[in-house]
Interface confidence: low
């Protein structure tokens, strides 16, 4: 099978996280059907999954994926070597760490092997698509009679991450949020010793090393304080 590879050219929106081009066609045919959009996420800069909605195809089709890096030493076209499948149809590609170059423009091309002219190319800024693992090892320290300090670890260089801390007592209807930058430390200056506090944290690859919008999963919660809030009407509702 001869596969035609489209190398992107012309003007591109360099501020966008991706740039989509489709092959022009002269007549209405299968080749005019748009290909599904490819979505890529880099997980903790350990591997990357680029996926598409295979069920959007009019009939089951094993779409193929190629990729390269624009204007770099890694601009050689690569075939996907590890496809992801959904109901035995290709629905994604997984790239390993050595194939990920965060600060070069990643070009990904999806193609219908039965219709070589039916192909779409996207340009992605991978540093904006990093999702870190959830924060780990949450610990609480009592700095004074009423002050708590929350610490945690991330399995990535801390400098690249910002964090969101949420906390609440068993009496609260909702979480209180606080943004924390890469120093991954948070202090709560006024703690009520009669209440039980719950803390959780999530992290994002932003803003020093990238501009990712997606947060990690929430950490496992950590608790502090009284376990006996028998009169608290919200206790059980908040466990969900």
């Amino acid at each position: 099978l001869n596969t035609t590879i489209l190398t992107p050219n012309g003007n591109e929106d360099t501020t966008a996280d991706f740039f989509l081009t489709t092959m022009p066609t002269d007549s209405l045919s299968v080749s005019t059907l748009p290909l599904p959009e490819v979505q890529c996420f880099v997980f903790n800069v350990e591997y990357m999954n680029c996926t598409w909605n295979s069920s959007s195809e009019p009939q089951p089709t094993n779409l193929t994926l190629h990729y390269w890096y624009k204007n770099s030493d890694n601009d050689k076209v690569q075939k996907c070597s590890h496809y992801l499948f959904s109901e035995e149809i290709t629905s994604g590609c997984q790239l390993q760490k050595k194939e990920i170059h965060l600060y070069q423009t990643f070009v990904v091309q999806l193609q219908d092997p039965r219709e070589p002219r039916r192909q779409a190319t996207q340009m992605l800024k991978l540093q904006n698509l990093v999702i870190p693992w959830a924060p780990e090892n949450l610990t609480l320290h009592k700095l004074s009679e009423s002050q708590l300090e929350l610490n945690w670890n991330n399995r990535f260089l801390n400098h690249c991450l910002e964090h969101l801390v949420q906390y609440r007592t068993d009496w609260d209807h909702s979480w209180t949020e606080q943004s924390v930058d890469y120093r991954h430390k948070f202090s709560l200056p006024s703690v009520d010793g009669q209440k039980r506090y719950t803390f959780r944290v999530r992290s994002r690859f932003n803003p020093l090393c990238g501009s990712a919008q997606h947060w990690s999963e929430w950490s496992h919660p950590i608790h502090w304080g009284s376990n006996t809030s028998k009169e608290n009407p919200f206790l059980f509702a908040l466990e969900a």
Partner: antibody, heavy 121, light 112 residues
Framework: QVQLQQWGAGLLKPSETLSLTCAVY????????WSWIRQPPGKGLEWIGE???????NYNPSLKSRVTISVDTSKNQFSLKLSSVTAADTAVYYC???????????????WGQGTLVTVSS | DVVMTQSPLSLPVTLGQPASISCRSS???????????LDWYLQKPGQSPQLLIY???NRASGVPDRFSGSGSGTDFTLKISRVEAEDVGVYYC?????????FGQGTKVEIK
């Protein structure tokens, strides 16, 4: 014990490119940013920029258009290039460790010995 | 950029006497996580700077306890309880709460 040893050309002509390298001994590259800081003769300190082990850089906006910091993790080294130098770039240039991601220590806890770079026609 | 202003710029001191240096920032250095990202460095004559104090009031490893840091927000102070001969040099404050990191202009401490 962490040690930073730096070297590079000490005398440049205007419009040339300053090039310095800093080698790190006794410390893994990962987990820290590695910075360049300069000090014009008789003046204060100015932070230039930083790089981590994976090559991610942050630069002082006042110098960003002329600065490139790179890293060679296989040698535990990082380098500074400053293009189109003028007499105003004459300074002692320091490499330093930091900042770390954690707030358990100060921003720059280990420093190189400094390299005097003079720009003169 | 955050401007860091130190005073005095020159400080003649007597051995064994206390000394105090002020550092003011143009913006509050209290970070969203509650900490003041303010370091103090000493640059002895002919040497590279060395870290003395971090987070406003924490002594770095190996720093004598005659050095102390205090303050919060925009006003910070470095105190030397009893000046020794080896304390001469230029003292700099550095803020790490706002990008980019900026230093004060330095305070030169010398023996009278």
């Amino acid at each position: 014990q962490v040690q930073l040893q730096q070297w590079g050309a000490g005398l440049l002509k205007p419009s040339e490119t300053l090039s310095l390298t800093c080698a790190v001994y006794g410390e893994s590259f990962s987990g820290y940013y590695w910075s360049w800081i300069r000090q014009p003769p008789g003046k204060g300190l100015e932070w230039i920029g930083e790089i981590n082990h994976s090559g991610s850089t942050n630069y002082n906006p006042s110098l960003k258009s002329r600065v490139t910091i790179s890293v060679d993790t296989s040698k535990n080294q990082f380098s500074l290039k400053l293009s189109s130098v003028t007499a105003a770039d004459t300074a002692v240039y320091y490499c330093a460790r930091g900042p770390a991601g954690s707030s358990s220590s100060g921003y720059f806890d280990y420093w190189g010995q400094g390299t005097l770079v003079t720009v003169s026609s | 950029d955050v401007v860091m202003t130190q005073s005095p710029l020159s400080l003649p001191v007597t051995l064994g006497q206390p000394a105090s240096i002020s550092c003011r920032s143009s913006q509050s250095l209290v970070h969203s996580n509650g900490y003041n990202y303010l370091d103090w460095y000493l640059q002895k004559p002919g040497q590279s700077p060395q870290l003395l104090i971090y987070l406003g009031s924490n002594r770095a490893s190996g720093v004598p306890d005659r050095f102390s840091g205090s303050g919060s927000g925009t006003d910070f102070t470095l105190k030397i309880s009893r000046v020794e001969a080896e304390d001469v040099g230029v003292y700099y404050c550095l803020q790490g709460s706002h990008w980019p990191w900026t230093f004060g202009q330095g305070t030169k401490v010398e023996i009278k």
